[in-house]
Amino acid sequence: ILLRAVTGFSGDGRAIWSKNPNFTPVNESQLFLYDTFPKNFFWGIGTGALQVEGSWKKDGKGPSIWDHFIHTHLKNVSSTNGSSDSYIFLEKDLSALDFIGVSFYQFSISWPRLFPDGIVTVANAKGLQYYSTLLDALVLRNIEPIVTLYHWDLPLALQEKYGGWKNDTIIDIFNDYATYCFQMFGDRVKYWITIHNPYLVAWHGYGTGMHAPGEKGNLAAVYTVGHNLIKAHSKVWHNYNTHFRPHQKGWLSITLGSHWIEPNRSENTMDIFKCQQSMVSVLGWFANPIHGDGDYPEGMRKKLFSVLPIFSEAEKHEMRGTADFFAFSFGPNNFKPLNTMAKMGQNVSLNLREALNWIKLEYNNPRILIAENGWFTDSRVKTEDTTAIYMMKNFLSQVLQAIRLDEIRVFGYTAWSLLDGFEWQDAYTIRRGLFYVDFNSKQKERKPKSSAHYYKQIIRENGFSL
């Protein structure tokens, strides 16, 4: 009660930073746990369309804001044609999935590959065929598809005509696109993600300018974009819930990403307050309206009163509970570069277990899908990616401890990524794939890295055996 009074936030997440053993959910003495994950744990791997598909203007695909951004903002990157060419080498991706033995494959649909100018009219036949073929192949292999509708590749036409996510007109257009996807693919897709990491879309797309569309310095635009992303997600959830769930019987969520942070002084109430503020300003910004009370976190409302849009009472009611599980992303994109505002002078940490505990306490112990997790290696590293294995072991150990020791309801894990590909502002200077791809080669062979062998073993053993 005292901490709540002092820190002024509605949830209970700040208990994570208390070093009182009776009060702290995480027992730091449990360094490694040799145990298995729950039976039927959902093991998967993911990719983002723009990162791996290539063929950015092939077969009638329209340009996305990222295709444009690459040509205007990123030096020494000609186009995503240099990527892993998943659009051409679908069979190779399927073989890679077979090799690892995953239960699910998380991929995103390129909106402009289906609708070149973003507006839902007649779909681009080749694009439709590609995703349909992929889904059929996954079903055949007993690999569950988890499909993301928006992983940052907004059709350029919508940016140019409406100003992209700054304009609330996009909400209905996105809903039309989602409706089409539900109609065409919903018979084969039981897990949908509306938007991948909206925080990065808003923060880097409109704040730092590091992501497409490359606008910067307008905090009001950042929060308007966030507002429209939340409302778009909510609209799509209600649409799915009302019109598609009854017969398709699937689940829908939004992937929210975050960093983790530790106080400089664990006994200092104000440092703990800053850590709470830090998490709230990144994860809570989107999680509170969707998984919480339907509104922005109180601290944000107070401190950003002149730039943060307001939800009406009706909208709060509409936003609240619009996710069937908590899809959580924890990876380098939320850490590098870290928004210094979010750091609040405290210490950034890669403690996924504590982040999961924070979610449990703040949002009433939801079912959690780790929708993106992993680290990166330098682009010069080929198949011997020992750092990636070390990081994966560390992260998976933390997830296992969260499940077994903290009773957190994690039901699935998405290793990121299946393939080396285009890594946003880092372009091709880093690699995140479990499969190595030589971007200069013609055939773009997928070569399993050490991490692929390691993950395959984890899946086979369903955890860590002694």
Epitope: G217, L219, A220, K302, K303, F305, S306, V307, M341
Partner: antibody, heavy 120, light 107 residues
């Protein structure tokens, strides 16, 4: 370094209007709010309202609603506060203050103040 | 509007003294409270935000505490340059409101 420089003192008759300017330098003008706070001689501080220079959005304290207008000219990094229908109790020093970027209710830099005297 | 009261309205102390005064809000304002220092003929200066966080460059002899409706401001060892009027400000609700101030001078 960050500076807010205000226009000089004004003497106005009751019923008239006054427009005070606040020129910002040393930072990106459009990234921070400008708030206006006044202080009658020997009295406390009274917050009048805010303006976001990026879009020009404003919010005024109820007490000043209908009498105050806050504007800006981004090409010269200057904010303005106009108060109309002046009365003697509006005699005060008027300060512009910068709201922090991520906590806009904390005023980290202030102008030197502009004395407005309302007298017949 | 939220009313802010401060007590005492003025106090006299010697250099090196520990000086404490209070600010009270007419309703719960959580931790949404800032403190400012104003020297004669000058503009106010932000010292503390969110009850107890020192603004960059502010000496550590200044501190703040409290939550809800009752807040305390402390100067651990009064220095001659601390002679000023100190105002609290709430931002729990618009309009933001300031306390009437506590004037600190030397004995």
């Amino acid at each position: 370094q960050v500076q807010l420089v205000q226009s000089g003192a004004e003497v106005k008759k009751p019923g008239a209007s006054v427009k005070v300017s606040c020129k910002a330098s040393g930072y990106t003008f459009t990234s921070y709010d400008i708030d206006w706070v006044r202080q009658a001689t020997g009295q406390g501080l009274e917050w009048m309202g805010w303006m976001n220079p990026n879009g020009g959005n404003t919010g005024y304290a109820q007490k000043f609603q209908g009498r105050v207008t806050m504007t800006r000219n981004t090409s010269i990094n200057t904010a303005y506060m106009e108060l109309s229908s002046l009365r003697s109790e509006d005699t005060a020093i008027y300060y512009c203050a910068r709201g922090k970027e991520f906590s806009r209710a904390e005023f980290d830099y202030w102008g030197q103040g502009t004395l407005v005297t309302v007298s017949s | 509007d939220i009313q802010m009261t401060q007590s005492p309205s003025s106090l006299s102390a010697s250099v090196g003294d520990r000086v404490t005064f209070t600010c009270q809000a007419s309703q719960d304002i959580n931790i949404y409270l800032n403190w400012y220092q104003q020297k004669p003929g000058k503009a106010p200066k932000l010292l503390i935000y969110d009850v107890s966080n020192l603004e960059t460059g502010v000496p550590s002899r200044f501190s703040g505490s409290g939550s809800g409706t009752d807040f305390t401001f402390t100067i651990s060892s009064l220095q001659p340059e601390d002679i000023a009027t100190y105002f609290c400000q709430q931002y729990d609700n618009l309009p933001f409101t300031f306390g009437p101030g506590t004037k600190v001078d030397l004995k």
